[in-house]
Interface confidence: medium
């Protein structure tokens, strides 16, 4: 008559779910920090670097008090999707200079993708409203020069590091409120 039914599904403990997401985010933060340091060693940054296509900063000290889990996860997922797209673009169009950051850049992309899937899973496990499918983003223009690619890499890795840093703090804070 077929296999016996499996054990009843235990509803996931949201704190444990959030814990594993924090661990993944921390791990990615450390990876990004190392890669950004590697980039700085190979191509020292003169001053600050910006890229208009990168997401604006979503969190700061003042915003922490009003954090809500659905909003944080939705915004974090959207921002990390943008960074994933930028890392993919960097690997494709960044020029030969940035090939010296492989395979680390590829590893970073894979881990970023994994964290995004983890966030998606966490949102469904916590029965949070799923965000609508992302509209197709306009293609990113290739850098105008090799130096342009390096400047973009500084901006992307710096922005991702800052986003992940705040994400860890925000997720830790939200865990205490569950």
């Amino acid at each position: 008559p077929g296999p016996p039914p499996g054990p009843p599904r235990v509803s996931p403990d949201p704190r444990a779910e959030l814990d594993s997401t924090v661990l993944l985010t921390r791990s990615l933060l450390a990876d990004t920090r190392q890669l950004a340091a590697q980039l700085r060693d190979k191509f020292p940054a003169d001053g600050d670097h910006n890229l208009d296509s990168l997401p604006t900063l979503a969190m700061s000290a003042g915003a922490l008090g009003a954090l809500q889990l659905p909003g944080v996860l939705t915004r974090l997922r959207a921002d990390l999707l943008s960074y994933l797209r930028h890392v993919q673009w960097l690997r494709r169009a960044g020029g030969s200079s940035l090939k010296t950051l492989e395979p680390e850049l590829g590893t970073l992309q894979a881990r970023l993708d994994r964290l995004l899937r983890r966030l998606q899973l966490l949102m469904s496990r916590l029965a949070l409203p799923q965000p609508p499918p992302d509209p197709p983003a306009p293609p990113l223009a290739p850098p105008s020069s090799a130096w342009g690619g390096i400047r973009a890499a500084h901006a992307i890795l710096g922005g991702l590091h800052l986003t992940l840093d705040w994400a860890v703090r925000g997720l830790l804070l939200l865990k205490t409120r569950l």
Partner: antibody, heavy 117, light 110 residues
């Protein structure tokens, strides 16, 4: 290279005022929350307060509330600390520091404020 | 009186492993990330450990951090003379809505 350079310290009488500045370079200043911390001679570190990257929020330690005000000018890459009604116990080296999350990843070299008659 | 409690002093000989403790409560260490700072004599503090156990770029892996419940610790292995400094633990405190520090531990390399 990230650099933070404080200035404006000096000798001031009790009840007096002083404005400290912190000039930032080597990073996108407008993306980071910024803090002031202090250290009295021979004592430990003490957090004074934080201002969010866009100036929309400020938090202060209880001992300075109502006397000290943190502000910033992102167009000038500069952080400020306006100190009023100064007391002898405010004598300290004042540091500005950058915050990317929960920690202070870069600090200035500090500026000494002496409150004495 | 500091919100976080650290021993005022610690010592060790070159090559040894030393540990500095930091204890707090659920409103600070228990619920928030712990960070450690090193202050060499006459200089500004420097970030040594963040988010409990992560090392910033440039900090040797002889330094490590850990946290359990409402206590945290900093370990330094293969002690060197240049490690002689003051070490401070720090965390955000939810009750005070402020960053709090330990009183600092003066490490002497004998």
């Amino acid at each position: 290279e990230v650099q933070l350079l404080e200035s404006g310290g000096g000798l001031v009488q009790p009840g007096g005022s002083l404005r400290l500045s912190c000039a930032a370079s080597g990073f996108t200043f407008s993306h980071y929350d910024m803090n002031w911390l202090r250290q009295a001679p021979g004592k430990g570190l003490e957090w004074v307060g934080v201002i969010s990257y866009d100036s929309s929020n400020k938090f202060y330690a209880d001992f300075v509330k109502g006397r000290f005000t943190i502000s910033r000018d992102n167009s000038k890459n500069t952080l400020y600390l306006q100190m009023n009604s100064l007391r002898a116990e405010d004598t300290a080296v004042y540091y500005c520091a950058r915050t990317p999350g929960s920690h202070f990843d870069y600090w200035g070299q500090g500026t000494l404020v002496t409150v004495s008659s | 009186q500091s919100v976080l409690t650290q021993p005022p002093s610690a010592s060790g000989t070159p090559g040894q492993r030393v540990t500095i403790s930091c204890s707090g409560s659920s409103s600070n260490i228990g619920n928030n990330a712990v960070n450690w700072y090193q202050q060499l004599p006459g200089t500004a503090p420097k970030l040594l450990i963040y988010y409990d156990d992560l090392l910033p770029s440039g900090v040797p892996d002889r330094f490590s951090g850990s946290k359990s419940g409402t206590s945290a610790s900093l370990a330094i292995s293969g002690l060197r003379s240049e490690d002689e400094a003051d070490y401070y633990c720090s965390a955000w405190d939810d009750s005070l809505n402020a960053v709090v520090f330990g009183g600092g531990t003066k490490l002497t390399v004998l």
